[in-house]
């Protein structure tokens, strides 16, 4: 009779975390009589996964009834797989012996790899705002994935970025891995509505990448432009001067009118007009009673935006 | 010697569409000599999947070298699985015969089920806008999933909806399935920023449901409220009357001022103020030269919003 063979038909099995893994094993003969055991790993440090003869293995179920006399199928199913279960599993036939059973023959082994999904990527931006034409850094982090192979891309709106650096840790074998990437983004005036997107592709995601986003609105400060103009006279002896504060972000803005250097009125912008690009406009107007002035008046519109140093624009009002 | 057994250790195997399926099969003896074949299904209509002896099976690879003299492992791998591959696969041993080989023994069969992901859900809303307190319908559709079991929920913002009806087609067995659901949503004035979400859970999604969204902003019309008020006089002989047009959506709005029923000025709203709830406000003002009027004046602010019938509010200006 042909000598018993231990057949482990699958060289490798890949299972998603949380699922069950079935490891196939069949004997080609009932003899020599003796139990089978499953181990993870080989050599002295191998870990017992299942012993047909004795012990309690709550996560392991046998596919066939191993107590049946003519059973040759010793496949097992391991429930609730985690990345820590990855490794090579050996189905080992023992022959009966005294005082101990003797290892007789091992299967070729089945490598179990565990597919664990990356956590949702978390994107974080700079601690302080920067103005257009400056460069800011965004980081993207995700953890707990396996296998190690992962692809990370950065986008600003729909456009792929190239200035970034990515690390996957640890460098060696591990039950699961983490990724950390830093992208450098040059701000433009139109970036209030812009987003940076960190996109990760992994075998567990079946072609649907995970995305983490951050709004550049949290990272940008667009300083206002000021324009002071005189409006057509609505009534005699009255001049209507407006200060158009344009294209600023974020909202926080305080405006002070000065007449010949003296504070005339201070206002905090409230009902702002939002532009399509997400910046804001605001207009303030000053009615000047020309009867009260003999000489020309210098009107100054002074704006303090988002806690920054004030900017101003002046207008010389001719008293005719 | 014990008679040859055909061992198919796995009763069932579940594979994601696009992956490969490994079907395990082992013989317990080299005799009787003869080839093996794999079939899908049993009986007269069974479909040949692999023939060790002859034929071309581009999607099938053998796990072991079947030409090796003492090979007892006849496991196969089928690549690029689609829902159409679902079924029960039998590993069948033939013994050599003349003129034809004779079927000798079949394995117990392995049922292959294919997990196919639902397509991204597409949510569509009503063709015409409706006003608050009215009910509108949204539909959600997804296709191509397997197995048939699927769970669909509707949410308005974070709150689960109960008024919906869902169908999964076809009712009988199929390689893949489609889902169609219709939800009825009662609009409220604050719904410009609201979303309806169609959420689908399926075994292939590993606990991350697919979501389709629609914005109620596409389905709602919030008519404006009008308020006409007189502002403090900036100059003698001038009355400043404002028309505050509040909480309307969408943007499209035309305003006409009438003095004693005669058109004074028509404006199209452009620079609007956006409220937190997504509705818009706009203010128009009219400077009335009281010198030109002997008697009281009735000023009317008439607004046409989003192509609907005009609404108006009047104000009696007393000429003192």
């Amino acid at each position: 009779e042909d000598e018993l063979q231990v057949i482990q038909p699958e060289k490798s099995v890949s299972v998603a975390a949380g699922e069950s893994a079935t490891l196939c094993c069949a004997m080609t003969s009932l003899i020599p009589v003796g139990p089978i055991m499953w181990f993870r790993g080989a050599g002295a440090g191998r870990e017992l996964i299942y012993n047909q003869k004795e012990g309690h293995f709550p996560r392991v179920t046998t596919v066939s009834e191993l107590t049946k006399r003519n059973n040759l199928d010793f496949s097992i199913s391991i429930s609730n797989i985690t990345p820590a279960d990855a490794g090579t599993y050996y189905c080992v036939k023992f022959r009966k012996g005294s005082p101990d059973d003797v290892e007789f023959k091992s299967g070729a082994g089945t490598e179990l790899s565990v597919r664990a999904k990356p956590s949702a990527p978390v994107v974080s931006g700079p601690a302080v705002r920067a103005t257009p034409e400056h460069t800011v850094s965004f980081t993207c982090e995700s953890h707990g994935f396996s296998p190690r192979d992962i692809t990370l891309k950065w986008f600003k709106n729909g456009n792929e970025l190239s200035d970034f650096q990515t690390n996957v840790d640890p460098a060696g074998d591990s039950v699961s891995y983490s990724i950390h990437s830093t992208a450098r983004v040059v701000l433009t005036r139109g970036d209030v509505h812009s987003q940076v997107i960190c996109e990760m592709a992994h075998i567990t995601l079946q072609g649907d990448p995970l995305r983490g986003t951050a709004n550049l609105s949290e990272a940008i400060r667009v300083p206002p432009t000021l324009e002071v103009t005189q409006q057509p006279m609505r009534a005699e002896n009255q001049a209507n001067v407006t200060c158009q504060v344009s294209n600023f972000y974020p909202r926080g803005l305080q405006l002070t009118w000065l007449e010949n250097g003296n504070v005339s009125r201070t206002e905090t912008a409230s009902t702002l007009i939002e532009n399509k690009d997400g910046t804001y406009n605001w207009m303030s107007w000053l009615l000047v009673n020309t009867c009260a002035h003999r000489d020309d008046v210098v009107l100054t519109c002074q704006v303090e935006h988002d806690g920054q140093q004030a900017v101003s624009k002046s207008y010389a009002l001719e008293i005719s | 010697e014990d008679e040859l057994q055909v061992i198919q250790p796995e009763k069932s195997v579940s594979v994601a569409a696009g992956e490969s399926a490994t079907l395990c099969c082992a013989m317990t003896s080299l005799i009787p000599v003869g080839p093996i074949m794999w079939f899908r299904g049993a009986g007269a209509g069974r479909e040949l999947i692999y023939n060790q002896k002859e034929g071309h099976f581009p999607r099938v690879t053998t796990v072991s070298e079947l030409t090796k003299r003492n090979n007892l492992d006849f496991s196969i791998s089928i690549s690029n699985i689609t829902p159409a591959d679902a079924g029960t696969y039998y590993c069948v041993k033939f013994r050599k015969g003349s003129p034809d080989d004779v079927e000798f023994k079949s394995g117990a069969g392995t049922e292959l089920s294919v997990r196919a992901k639902p397509s991204a859900p597409v949510v569509s809303g009503p063709a015409v806008r409706a006003t608050p307190e009215h009910t509108v319908s949204f539909t959600c559709e997804s296709h191509g999933f397997s197995p048939r079991d699927i769970t669909l929920k509707w949410f308005k913002n974070g709150n689960e909806l109960s008024d919906f009806q869902t169908n999964v087609d076809p009712a009988g067995d199929s390689v893949s399935y489609s889902i169609h659901s219709t939800a009825r949503v009662v609009l409220t004035r604050g719904d410009v920023h609201s979303q309806v979400i169609c959420e689908m859970a399926h075994i292939t999604l590993q606990g991350d449901p697919l979501r389709g969204t629609a914005n109620l902003s596409e389905a709602i019309r919030v008519p404006p409220t009008l308020e006409v008020t007189q502002q403090p006089m900036r100059a003698e002989n001038q009355a400043n009357v404002t028309c505050q047009v509040s909480n309307f959506y969408p943007r499209g709005l035309q305003l006409t001022w009438l003095e004693n029923g005669n058109v004074s000025r028509t404006e199209t709203a452009s620079t609007l103020i956006e409220n937190k709830d997504g509705t818009y406000n706009w203010m128009s003002w009219l400077l009335v030269n009281t010198c030109a009027h002997r008697d009281d004046v009735v000023l009317t602010c008439q607004v046409e919003h989003d192509g609907q019938q005009a609404v108006s509010k009047s104000y009696a200006l007393e000429i003192s």
Partner: antibody, heavy 120, light 107 residues
Framework: QVQLVQSGAEVKKPGASVKVSCKAS????????ISWVRQAPGQGLEWMGW????????NYAQKLQGRVTMTTDTSTSTAYMELRSLRSDDTAVYYC?????????????WGRGTLVTVSS | DIQMTQSPSSVSASVGDRVTITCRAS??????LAWYQQKPGKAPKLLIY???NLQSGVPSRFSGSGSGTDFTLTISSLQPEDFATYYC?????????FGGGTKVEIK
């Protein structure tokens, strides 16, 4: 067919030795261990020991240690049990039995038994 | 050594009766218990192995149950050929031990 054929009855004097044979046929002899079980007249079953030709392993009951030897001859598919220094309480029917459990011990095939009488 | 205690030591029953024999191990033996039938002048015959598995060729009126320390052999409907002595045997470890036997007699 699958069977175990034992040697004939023996009458022995106290202090003598007896060697009982058990010939296997119809199956692969080296594949299965053989146990020896005895039964004194009107008594229950008593396990004596075990031998596995595959590795030459043996295991004997403590009370018989030093008096019993079990051997096999794979060329003739025969198992032997020799019991020395016989006493009157060794009078019994001696059975050989094939042991078939993979993780456990049970006996699915028995010889017909050999009566050994120890009498002065 | 693992002691096996069988009860009752004898039972009188009639054809068609349901007969139950119990066996207790002095320590846990998982499911590694066998049941044998022996008739006078004959070798024992294996009925049940691994506590509940019916040996090939044995009628289905015989069944076994139990695990750990307590086991039962049941004959669902006693037939004339079933009058015999029944032994349990632990197969968990050396030395292999048998119960004292239960004699099933005609009432």
């Amino acid at each position: 067919q699958v069977q175990l054929v034992q040697s004939g009855a023996e009458v022995k004097k106290p202090g003598a030795s007896v060697k009982v044979s058990c010939k296997a046929s119809g199956y692969t002899f080296t594949g299965y261990p053989i146990s020896w079980v005895r039964q004194a007249p009107g008594q229950g079953l008593e396990w004596m020991g075990w031998i596995y030709a595959y590795g030459g392993n043996t295991n004997y009951a403590q009370k018989l240690q030093g008096r019993v030897t079990m051997t096999t001859d794979t060329s003739t598919s025969t198992a032997y049990m020799e019991l020395r220094s016989l006493r009157s309480d060794d009078t019994a029917v001696y059975y050989c039995a094939r042991e078939a459990g993979s993780s456990w011990y049970d006996f699915d095939l028995w010889g017909r038994g050999t009566l050994v009488t120890v009498s002065s | 050594d693992i002691q096996m205690t069988q009860s009752p030591s004898s039972v009188s029953a009639s054809v068609g009766d349901r007969v139950t024999i119990t066996c207790r191990a002095s320590q846990g033996i998982s499911s590694w218990l066998a049941w044998y039938q022996q008739k006078p002048g004959k070798a024992p015959k294996l009925l049940i192995y691994a506590a509940s598995n019916l040996q090939s060729g044995v009628p289905s009126r015989f069944s076994g149950s139990g695990s750990g320390t307590d086991f039962t052999l049941t004959i669902s409907s006693l037939q004339p050929e079933d009058f015999a002595t029944y032994y349990c045997q632990q197969g968990a470890s050396f030395p292999i031990t048998f119960g004292g036997g239960t004699k099933v007699e005609i009432k």
